[in-house]
Interface confidence: low
């Protein structure tokens, strides 16, 4: 009831707790002398469902039949209305609508660890919306029984607080759960099990790893387990991987040798335990052990390339470049690279250790046959050396790849294509595509990039260290034994018209013509590969269209003659530069008057 109900009563039939879909009868009646003063016939009783009127009646009592109540709680209040006064609350009642409990399903019991206690879980089924009591019963050998009750509205778990022991591991125990509420009761199917069925071992602990003689091939994992554990499963993976390697072991007694670990790799290890081959359940996974495997000597060979530069009649500069080994090939921290330079006929050799760089430059005589060997070393040893005979990579004209082209391919990619050399194409052992940023001065400090391509390929996509709006000098080498041929081309991944034109720095007169000299456009303003320069000129103070001369772009060129100027006429000259995307704005203007005689 809601309050003391001094003025009257509300009665509910058949019960305050009803089954979903049932009808309930609600009666509100006034106590003697509690109606409206003087006018008992004017008594007006009103029944509210929450705040909404659902019925009224003049007199001392009111009967109402209510159907269709929802699951849960509904509040009814009876009030008295008299003339010229506010409604007075008489009494009220709550109706609880629910359902009988469904049969609990999937009753399952577990004991965590050999020293743990038996606890059971089940599925309650649909919510009864009513106070429901669950009783869990366990019966064992020798008529032993245990019982535990749970009065939580959402009860689906109970712990008996008893410990099953392994003295008779095959003895049967039976559990059953019964749910009871005001509308009925229901029991689960019995669940019968033995000690071995329900004991779930604690996860292994104190996990350690040992590498005999600091070798990854002699690795043992150690751990501790509860006494009755028969089976273990191990899982391990590199820390940066999602995929686990799994191993099942029997009677491991807390140790197992792992044979397939990779060197110099951080691994995560976990172990789980079980008491019986086909009974019971696996423990939770142990806490992770993280450990790094030892280094092994590098495997694989360095990808080495080189560049030759003429210094003078007797000397040449050799620049060696190599790529880092992959993590799986390095198998440790590379401490240094060993470079050996040898003159093959005289046998002279020089060895140097390089740290912190993947390139090396030296000067050698132009005479003799030279070879280099480069290897990578970690704490355990060195990779097999990559040996290269130093040759003139472009000497064999017949080996030069033909029709080399370079085209933008998507963003920051250049697709290089070529045709095999005229000489027997089957002689080609491999192609090397080399690229570097184009610098007018031919700066040897500019990083060199390369990739190797199989002899049957006639294209390569270059994407490493490619920037937009930068021109690259691209060379394709065809290598065959100790011979090489090459072809080169300029290419860019993305281009715009240059941001500025060349700056004319001098105009000189030579035998009736003029020589124009200019400064190169800064690389960052070229916006791609330059195709042409244009020189424009017109008579000063003239409105006529300027004349122009278009010069194909060559890296080293920075002057050009013009011989079509009239003597003793003052001209204004300027220059522009063009990429495939368009023409730059013009550079500075210079005036010049040819002094010589007319032709």
């Amino acid at each position: 009831k809601i309050d003391a109900c001094k003025r009257g009563d509300v009665t509910v039939k058949p019960s305050h707790v009803i089954l979903l879909g049932s009808t309930v009868n609600i009666t509100c009646s006034l106590k003697p002398r509690q109606g409206c003063f003087h006018y008992s016939r004017r008594n007006k009783l009103i029944l509210y469902k929450f705040d909404r009127r659902i019925n009224f009646h003049h007199g001392h009592s009111l009967n109402s039949q209510v159907t269709g109540l929802p699951l849960g709680t509904t509040l009814f209040v009876c009030k008295l209305a008299c003339i010229n006064s506010d409604e007075i609350q008489i009494c009220g009642a709550e109706i609880f609508v629910g359902v009988a409990p469904e049969q609990p399903q999937n009753l399952s019991c577990i004991q965590k660890g050999e020293q743990g206690t038996v606890a059971c879980t089940w599925e309650r089924g649909r919510d009864t919306h009513l106070y429901t009591e669950y009783t869990l019963q366990l019966s064992g050998p020798k008529n032993l029984t245990w019982q535990k009750q749970c009065k939580d509205i959402y009860c689906d778990y109970l712990d008996f607080g008893i410990n099953l022991t392994p003295e008779s591991p095959e003895s049967n125990f039976t559990a059953k759960v019964t749910a009871v509420n005001s509308l009925g009761s229901s029991s689960s199917l019995p669940s019968t099990f033995t000690f071995l069925d329900i004991v779930r071992p604690l996860p292994p602990w104190d996990i350690r790893i040992k590498f005999q003689k600091a070798s990854v091939s002699r690795c043992t994992l150690y751990w501790r387990d509860e006494g009755l554990v028969l089976l273990n499963r191990l899982r391990y993976r590199p820390s940066n991987s999602r995929l686990w390697n799994m191993v099942n072991v029997t009677k491991a007694k807390g140790r197992h040798d792992l044979l397939d670990l990779k060197p110099f790799t951080e691994y995560e290890f976990q172990i789980s335990s079980k008491l019986h081959l086909y009974k019971g359940s696996w423990s939770d996974w142990s806490e992770s052990l993280r450990a790094q495997t030892p280094e092994e000597e590098p495997t694989g060979m360095l990808d080495v390339w080189y560049m030759k530069r003429h210094i003078d009649y007797s000397r040449q500069q050799i620049s060696l470049f190599w790529k880092n080994l992959s993590v799986s090939e390095a198998r440790g921290k590379i401490l240094h690279y060993q470079v050996t330079l040898q003159e093959l006929t005289g046998g002279k050799a020089m060895t140097q250790n390089i740290t912190g760089h993947t390139s090396w430059t030296t000067v050698i005589p132009r005479t003799g046959n030279w070879a280099v060997a480069v290897s990578a070393a970690n704490s355990k040893g060195s990779s097999l050396p990559t040996r290269i005979n130093i040759m003139n990579l472009c000497e064999a004209g017949l080996l030069a790849p033909r029709q080399v082209s370079a085209n933008s391919e998507g963003m920051d990619n250049i697709l290089v294509t070529w045709q095999p050399p005229r000489k027997d194409p089957s002689a080609v052992q491999e192609y090397v595509v080399e690229w570097r940023e184009l610098h007018p001065g031919g700066d040897t400090q500019v990083p060199l990039n390369w990739l190797r391509s199989r002899p049957y390929n006639v294209s390569a996509l270059i994407s490493e260290n490619i920037k937009s709006y930068i021109c690259y000098e691209i060379r394709v080498y065809a290598l065959s034994g100790d011979q090489g041929g090459c072809s080169s081309i300029l290419g860019n991944s993305k281009h715009k018209a240059p941001l500025s034109g060349p700056h004319i720095n001098a105009i000189t007169e030579e035998k009736g013509s003029i020589l124009i000299s200019w400064n190169s456009i800064p690389v960052q303003e070229q916006m791609g590969c330059l195709l042409h320069y244009r020189i424009y000129w017109k008579e000063r103070d003239s409105n006529s269209q300027p004349q122009l001369c278009e010069i194909p772009y060559r890296v080293s060129q920075n002057s050009h003659p013009i011989n079509s100027l009239q003597p003793r006429v003052t001209y204004v000259l300027w220059m522009t530069a063009l990429t495939a995307a368009g023409e730059s704005s013009h550079g500075n203007e210079r005036e010049f008057c040819l002094q010589g005689k007319a032709n």
Partner: nanobody, 120 residues
């Protein structure tokens, strides 16, 4: 095969910002290009921004100056910072990773996509 997992999409008002993330796993050593594409219903998927292993970036003209692509090599993750968002940026944004080897596209892997809605 490279697995790509995008996150960070959502509803934002015009002028607002979002940061999309794309985590790569699997054969990540082979990736040359990572980028973001977008698609509106009934239209072709279009490139928004792309970043090469060399670290250079490219943007479609309509997002230049507003969107920034970046990456965290240690986490194998590429990001797209989207500022000054406009209603026409509404689309499903897809992460893409391309692996080129010796001039051939050996892998072209896509994420599941994340919805970006710009609306007041």
């Amino acid at each position: 095969q490279v697995q790509l997992q995008e996150s960070g999409g959502g509803l934002v008002q015009p002028g607002g910002s979002l940061r999309l993330s794309c985590a790569a796993s699997g054969s990540i050593l082979r990736i040359n290009l990572m980028g973001w594409y977008r698609q509106v219903p009934g239209k072709q998927r279009e490139l928004v921004a792309e970043m090469s292993t060399g670290g250079s970036t490219t943007y479609v003209d309509s997002v230049e100056g507003r969107f920034t692509i970046s990456r965290d090599n240690a986490k194998n993750t590429v990001y797209l910072q989207m500022n000054s968002l406009k209603p026409e940026d509404t689309a499903v944004y897809y992460c893409n990773a391309k692996a080129w080897q010796l001039g051939r596209l050996e892998n072209d892997d896509w994420g599941q996509g994340t919805q970006v809605t710009v609306s007041s």
